[in-house]
């Protein structure tokens, strides 16, 4: 079976994947929106804000097929991808325009799923095998969480769901995807 690519509403090409897409990769190109060109945070943006509304998290819709071994969903499903780093909302548009991206040098901020929804899909199989019904877990919304280093980089601190919504009137821009991401394996990735 070949790679079937299709577009989402942010004009991003997404390969066909299994139940769960590969987590968004850490992009190596330091001029992408997920990296500061010179690393660290600029001194005039001290990391002291306590206002959750100052933090923004990007939600991109994308469409994919669900696979289970040789079987594939009759229709594609649409879900969200929680995009990259979180930073103060007031800095996001301008920072991108300058080719800069705010990123704290201390705690790491992650844009990760906030809520999931279940959707039943019908999987069609080759060779006359009976269709299979599966219920898949799809990302329904995203939020910013803080990753603190004193927790072995594994404990995520929730900034709350209020920070999870993209700002109104600003359509998310497509994320650059690395070659590695586009070569994600097509397997029965549940």
């Amino acid at each position: 079976q070949g790679w079937q690519a299709f577009k989402n509403d942010a004009t991003e090409i997404i390969p066909e994947l299994g139940e769960y897409p590969e987590p968004p990769p850490e992009l190596e190109n330091n001029k992408t929106m997920n990296r500061a060109e010179n690393g660290g945070r600029p001194p005039h943006h001290p990391f002291e804000t306590k206002d959750v509304s100052e933090y923004s998290c990007r939600e991109l819709h994308f469409t994919r097929y669900v696979t289970d071994g040789p079987c594939r969903s009759a229709k594609p499903v649409t879900e969200l991808v929680c995009s990259g780093q979180c930073g103060p909302a007031r800095l996001l548009p301008n920072a991108i325009g300058r080719g800069k991206w705010w990123r704290p040098s201390g705690p790491d901020f992650r844009c990760i799923p906030d809520r999931y929804r279940a959707q039943r899909v019908q999987l069609l199989c080759p060779g006359g095998e009976a269709p299979r019904a599966r219920k898949v877990r799809l990302v329904a919304s995203c939020k910013c969480k803080r990753l603190t280093r004193f927790h072995n980089q594994s404990e995520l601190k929730d900034f709350g769901t209020e920070a999870a919504r993209p700002q109104k009137g600003r359509k998310p821009r497509p994320r650059a995807r690395s070659a590695k991401a586009n070569q994600a394996e097509l397997e029965n990735a549940y």
């Epitope: 994947l17 299994g18 139940e19 769960y20 897409p21 590969e22 987590p23 968004p24 289970d68 929680c82 992650r110 990760i112 799923p113 809520r115 999931y116 929804r117 279940a118 039943r120 019904a133 599966r134 219920k135 898949v136 877990r137 990302v139 969480k145 594994s154 404990e155 995520l156 394996e185 397997e187 990735a189 549940y190």
Partner: antibody
Framework: QVQLVESGGGLVQPGGSLRLSCAAS????????LSWVRQAPGKGLEWVSV???????YYADSVKGRFTISRDNSKNTLYLQMNSLRAEDTAVYYC??????????WGQGTLVTVSS | DIALTQPASVSGSPGQSITISCTGT?????????VSWYQQHPGKAPKLMIY???NRPSGVSNRFSGSKSGNTASLTISGLQAEDEADYYC???????????FGGGTKLTVL
């Protein structure tokens, strides 16, 4: 074939810490949700924690604030850091792969004994 | 999440059929396609026997079947065999899809 192998269990005193590991092979690790499930001696199964493919983590109320689940996709390994251990945490701990909202593969388990 | 309720034990003779029930609230088993069953022999890891209420993984005997009516899911084993003697657990997920709940387990004895 899919394999999950737990390690790191042992005897620890109440209040102590332990880190369990689960080495995975035979599937694309980063694309799957993974859980820890435990079973106290002579008792039933109890779900402990799960990590999603995007780094999100979730816990049973009984371990929240004491246990931390994490994954290293580069090493195909799942971890469970257990702090402030109590006698009631004594159990065999299994890691399990979450497939379409059920567990299709389980490790053989590792025994954690909390006793003074 | 509220625990799922199973009978502590059931028994049957070889060749007979038995049914193990699993009852919960609507958020646990009231939704379609969300109950799985696991078999566990003493000292062994659990093994998935039924998923999505009534689907069998490859390699599981067709003597095992699942069903659901209202808030009660059931596992039926037909043509009982000695090797079926084990503990059986039902399981479902929480409303958030990020937590799980198991039944208390049922010990099956083949007489």
């Amino acid at each position: 074939q899919v394999q999950l192998v737990e390690s790191g269990g042992g005897l620890v005193q109440p209040g102590g810490s332990l880190r369990l590991s689960c080495a995975a092979s035979g599937f694309t690790f980063r694309s799957h949700w993974l859980s820890w499930v435990r079973q106290a001696p002579g008792k039933g199964l109890e779900w402990v924690s799960v990590t999603g493919v995007h780094g999100d983590t979730y816990y049973a109320d009984s371990v929240k604030g004491r246990f931390t689940i994490s994954r290293d996709n580069s090493k195909n390994t799942l971890y469970l850091q257990m702090n402030s251990l109590r006698a009631e945490d004594t159990a065999v701990y299994y890691c399990a792969r979450d497939t379409y909202l059920h567990f299709d593969y389980w490790g053989q388990g590792t025994l954690v004994t909390v006793s003074s | 999440d509220i625990a799922l309720t199973q009978p502590a034990s059931v028994s049957g003779s070889p060749g007979q059929s038995i049914t193990i029930s699993c009852t919960g609230t609507s958020s646990d088993v009231g939704d379609i396609n969300d109950v799985s069953w696991y078999q566990q022999h003493p000292g062994k890891a659990p093994k998935l026997m039924i998923y999505d209420v009534n689907n069998r993984p490859s390699g599981v005997s067709n003597r095992f079947s699942g069903s659901k009516s209202g808030n009660t899911a059931s596992l039926t084993i037909s043509g009982l065999q000695a090797e079926d003697e084990a503990d059986y657990y039902c399981s479902s997920y929480g409303e958030s899809l990020t937590s799980y709940v198991f039944g208390g387990g049922t010990k099956l004895t083949v007489l």
